[in-house]
């Protein structure tokens, strides 16, 4: 009989239904934009925009100030008033499309859907640890803007991304806007532009550089700008757009656009297609070679990575990596595979690929038929010619014109499809110690904080909790303030510690103390918590063993029982080796002697499951009484493990000492050849782990065992004779004198 401990799924060591309450702010309307500010003198603020209003919050998410940003045409609109007395049309709500910090001043810049997409500059005024907004400056000069040429028209009602870069004494706004024919006709926003903020804050300098979707493509070719960021010498925009100007506009893919952050020019504008795939370890029949494509970027964030992930990505620790969450299509619902996948694109590698693409286009010999691309922005041409020109004239450089790199950058899902049905809607990546953590918001209003690591077949969670009861999607933009991240969902802003909201979701001491150091988890009594939550004994160095089950549940009062104990924190050594004198098991008053692990029975335990087994030989003391009792495991003097040492006692009820009684045996005779089916009747015949029926000292092969009955087949007899028949349970003979008669066959 080889009983094995039942597997405990790894998920049983945590509970993601544990409620965490994190600080929040109700904005009074759907949050449209959010940005944080941290000053040099310990002052900080959170700026939250909703329709027609801008809130200023302190670091504690308490309201400090509120500003009316609309409706345009309403005299109560405070930002509108900064543009002076009239004319005030056209009336309309102000949806905030841009909310960015200009770090040079410092100032907050907000741009809305009303008033031709103009922007307002709000100087920041520190007041203690809080920040107030000074009276806004209207970045719009009525006399300098026309419908066909409007340097001060920044925001598109269809969406705009802005990154502010300091160059010398000036602030340059790198602006990317989604357009359609109607928007393009109204005060002419541009698809991509670099605009210099005028020193007197009266607007943006005229004559700025820009690229725009050509009028003939505006109806069919729309570009969504998902994210923008500045790192090193470049500003990057991430887009979702049709894969081709000529083909089906619903066939989308993701591109990265790179612009120089040191020169306000667009001659070195470059685009690169980003290809993210889910490549399951075992490919299904009919699944595409190279994995299933996830062409549509949903959210992105760039961050320096920790040592472990850096090694897996073959880059140096601290290098910047662009992380993107991708889905199969605009609706995000695939037929097979996970809903969301996460791909990592090291920035240095992106830059190298772009530079190689430029070489392919501009350095001889150029592959015939290699196109410059970006036909939605410029006239079609072949490399190395400039757009719209048949040949390169001596005074133009191939490199000084926008280019789509001819090869794409392909990566596979870091999570190996383990996000499953989760639809990720927000992403922020941080480095904590040497660990890289993805903080993700979901479609159903949850936050997942997961270690970014590639080599596992399960997710390493810091946390997985619901932000509130509304279940509304977490919005795309996430901001950091100190050691917290700010997520928006519905009309609320939530402040989530980057170390996780707490430790209560870890249910076992072992899982608790195995948590990352940065989480600050410790064990207090019977729960996992941070020190501030534990009024009593809080410690991070040891765990008691935990008994969850044992087998068998009964044993003979005389004779031994091989007891198998199940649980966790028994020895913390994969080999199952138990140092001498560390583990003491008692059943009732009786000791149970530890047995060495049978190496042939060692099974590899997948990390998604966990259970530990421990075996001992129970020999009841003479003083042991019949009846129910407890099983107790005490572990002491254990050497420290990787995360903690095992120390303490675990007690489990439910073992019973019993006395087997043999009442009847039949038949009492049978052929000398053997094979007679003997039935032994009695009580407690199945207790313990071993039993044997002996006919003249030879084992009668057991066919069935139950509490009241044993069936066995007699062995052959040496001669015709009456021979002794006995029953042993746990190696000890059950009282009674019985004989079996061998007869001629």
């Amino acid at each position: 009989e080889d009983w094995q401990c039942p597997r405990t799924p790894y998920a049983a060591s945590r509970d993601f239904d544990v409620k965490y309450v994190v600080p929040s702010f109700s904005a009074g309307g759907l949050v449209q934009a959010m940005v944080t500010y941290e000053g040099d003198r310990n002052e900080s603020a959170v700026f939250v925009a909703i329709r027609n209003r801008l809130h200023v919050l302190g670091p504690d998410l308490k309201s400090v100030q509120s500003l009316a940003t609309g409706p345009a045409g309403d005299p109560g609109c405070q930002t509108c008033a900064a543009c002076g007395p009239g004319p005030h049309g056209p009336p309309g709500d102000t949806d905030t499309k841009v909310l960015v910090l200009d770090p040079a001043l410092p100032a907050l810049v907000s741009c809305g859907s009303s008033l031709q997409g103009r922007c307002f500059l709000h100087d920041l005024e520190p007041q203690g640890t809080a920040v107030h907004l000074a009276a806004p400056a209207c970045l719009f000069s009525a006399h300098h803007n026309r419908p066909d040429d409007c340097p001060d028209c920044v925001a598109s009602p269809l969406g705009t991304r802005v990154t502010v870069v300091e160059q010398g004494q000036a602030s340059y706004f790198y602006v990317a806007s989604s357009l359609d024919a109607a928007v393009a006709a109204s005060f002419s926003p541009r698809s991509v532009s670099i605009r210099r903020l005028k020193a007197d804050a009266s607007g943006f300098a005229p004559g700025f550089v820009a690229l725009s979707v050509l009028p003939k493509h505006l109806v069919s070719y729309s570009i969504e700008y998902v994210h923008s960021f500045h790192t090193g010498a470049f500003v990057y925009f991430l887009t979702v757009q049709p894969a081709s100007v000529t083909d089906d506009p619903s066939a989308l893919h993701t591109r990265l656009a790179r612009l120089s952050a040191t020169e306000p020019e667009l001659g070195d504008y470059r685009e690169l297609v980003l290809d993210c795939r889910f490549a399951p370890k075992r490919r299904r029949r009919g699944a595409p070679e190279g994995g299933q494509p996830y062409p549509v970027l949903r959210v992105a964030h760039s961050a320096p990575v920790g040592a472990q992930l850096a090694t897996e990505l073959s880059i140096a620790e601290g290098q910047e990596v662009l992380f993107g969450v991708f889905v199969t299509g605009k609706d995000g619902g695939p037929g097979v595979g996970p809903n969301s996948v996460v791909c990592a694109f090291p920035i240095d590698l992106l830059d190298t690929l772009i530079d190689e693409g430029v070489e392919r286009c501009c350095e001889s010999p150029v592959h015939p038929g290699l196109r410059r691309g970006l036909d939605f922005f410029q006239s079609p041409s072949f490399c190395p010619n400039p757009p719209g020109l048949e040949a390169l004239s001596p005074n133009t450089s191939c490199r000084h014109f926008p280019l789509l790199v001819s090869s794409s950058f392909s990566r596979v899902d870091l999570f190996n499809g383990l996000l499953g049905p989760v639809q990720v809607t927000a992403l922020y990546v941080t480095r904590l110690d040497n660990v890289t953590v993805a903080h993700m918001g979901t479609m159903d209003g949850r936050i997942l904080q997961v270690e970014l690591v590639r080599s596992l077949n399960y997710l390493l969670y810091v946390s997985n909790f619901s932000l509130g009861d509304s279940g509304q999607p977490v919005q795309r933009d996430v901001s950091r303030l100190g050691d917290h991240l700010l997520f928006a969902s519905g009309d609320q802003v939530f402040q989530v510690p980057i170390q996780g909201p707490g430790c209560r979701h870890f249910l076992t001491c072992g899982r608790c103390l195995r948590a990352w150091h940065f989480m600050g988890c410790g064990w207090c009594g019977n729960m996992c918590g941070q020190q501030k939550e534990c009024p009593g004994s809080w410690q991070q160095d040891h765990c008691p063993p935990k008994l969850t089950e044992f087998h068998p549940h009964s044993g003979p009062l005389r004779g031994s029982t091989r007891l198998t104990l199940c649980g966790s924190n028994f020895y913390l050594h994969p080999s199952g080796l138990v140092p001498e004198g560390t583990h003491q098991v008692t059943v009732g008053q009786s000791p149970c002697r530890p047995l060495p692990k049978d190496s042939s029975k060692l099974r590899p335990v997948p990390r998604k499951d966990f259970v530990e087994e421990f075996e001992c030989e129970l020999e009841p003391l003479g003083t042991q009484a019949v009846g129910p009792t407890n099983v107790s495991l005490t572990v002491t003097n254990m050497p420290p493990g990787k995360h903690f040492r095992v120390d303490g006692t675990s007690v489990l009820r439910g073992f019973s000492f019993m006395e087997p009684v043999l009442i009847a045996v039949q038949p009492l005779f049978g052929p000398r050849a053997g094979g007679t089916c003997l039935t032994l009747e009695g009580q407690s015949l199945s207790v313990g782990t071993s039993r044997a029926v002996l006919v003249n000292g030879t084992e009668c092969l057991l066919a069935r065992v139950s509490e009241g009955q044993l069936l066995c087949a007699t062995p052959p007899g040496a001669t015709v004779a009456s021979v002794p028949l006995s029953l042993q349970v746990g190696g000890a003979q059950v009282p009674g004198s019985w004989t079996f008669q061998y007869r001629e066959d």
């Epitope: 500003l67 009316a68 045409g73 309403d74 005299p75 109560g76 609109c77 405070q78 930002t79 509108c80 008033a81 900064a82 002076g84 007395p85 009239g86 004319p87 005030h88 100087d123 907004l133 000074a134 009276a135 806004p136 400056a137 209207c138 000069s141 009525a142 006399h143 300098h144 005028k198 007197d200 804050a201 009266s202």
Partner: antibody, heavy 121, light 107 residues
Framework: EVQLLESGGGLVQPGGSLRLSCAAS????????MMWVRQAPGKGLEWVSS????????TYADSVKGRFTISRDNSKNTLYLQMNSLRAEDTAVYYC??????????????WGQGTMVTVSS | DIQMTQSPSSLSASVGDRVTITCRAS??????LNWYQQKPRKAPQLLIY???SLQSGVPSRFSGSGSGTDFTLTISSLQPEDFATYYC?????????FGQGTRLELK
Amino acid sequence: EVQLLESGGGLVQPGGSLRLSCAASGFTFSKYFMMWVRQAPGKGLEWVSSIYPSGGDTTYADSVKGRFTISRDNSKNTLYLQMNSLRAEDTAVYYCARWGIVGVPNAFDIWGQGTMVTVSS
Amino acid sequence: DIQMTQSPSSLSASVGDRVTITCRASPDIGTYLNWYQQKPRKAPQLLIYAASSLQSGVPSRFSGSGSGTDFTLTISSLQPEDFATYYCQQSYTTPLTFGQGTRLELK
């Protein structure tokens, strides 16, 4: 304390010139539209001119267009009104006023005490 | 230009009286209307902005109402310091224009 203080008024002959100044204090002058408003003796209030925060754009009442010039020096927190070709009907108390934004949008929320300009031969 | 017409041009009342001054705009100015109080030899002071919003520090006995073309300033219970001239002003567009004023005097 938020304050506006006008100066430069006085008696001038028809056809003559005068330059009014308005010194601002207690607020970020460079953020606000500034205005001149006048009031003839025993009469009502009349808006004269306004200037953008940067000083780049200006607007005038028809009655003074081409004769008056509004300007500002944000580094000195000062507003000016250069009045040329003065006429008898320009006789008035000239007030400098701030155009409100935060708190009190779209109104003259701060006024100076006024300076008297008399055009007479 | 937007015309602003105030009535009455003058008004006699006693302390404790409820007083109403009206202002008519032509054409429609939404709620872009402000009310000012001016005492002799003093600068005007803002009482009400955006037709009905009370300026900070102004007593609550002053209130404003109306939108479009017809507006009202009400003083619920006249106090001795309220005897002054009152002006309405449109802030809808330039040129900014004022009503001709209403002189409120002690009966």
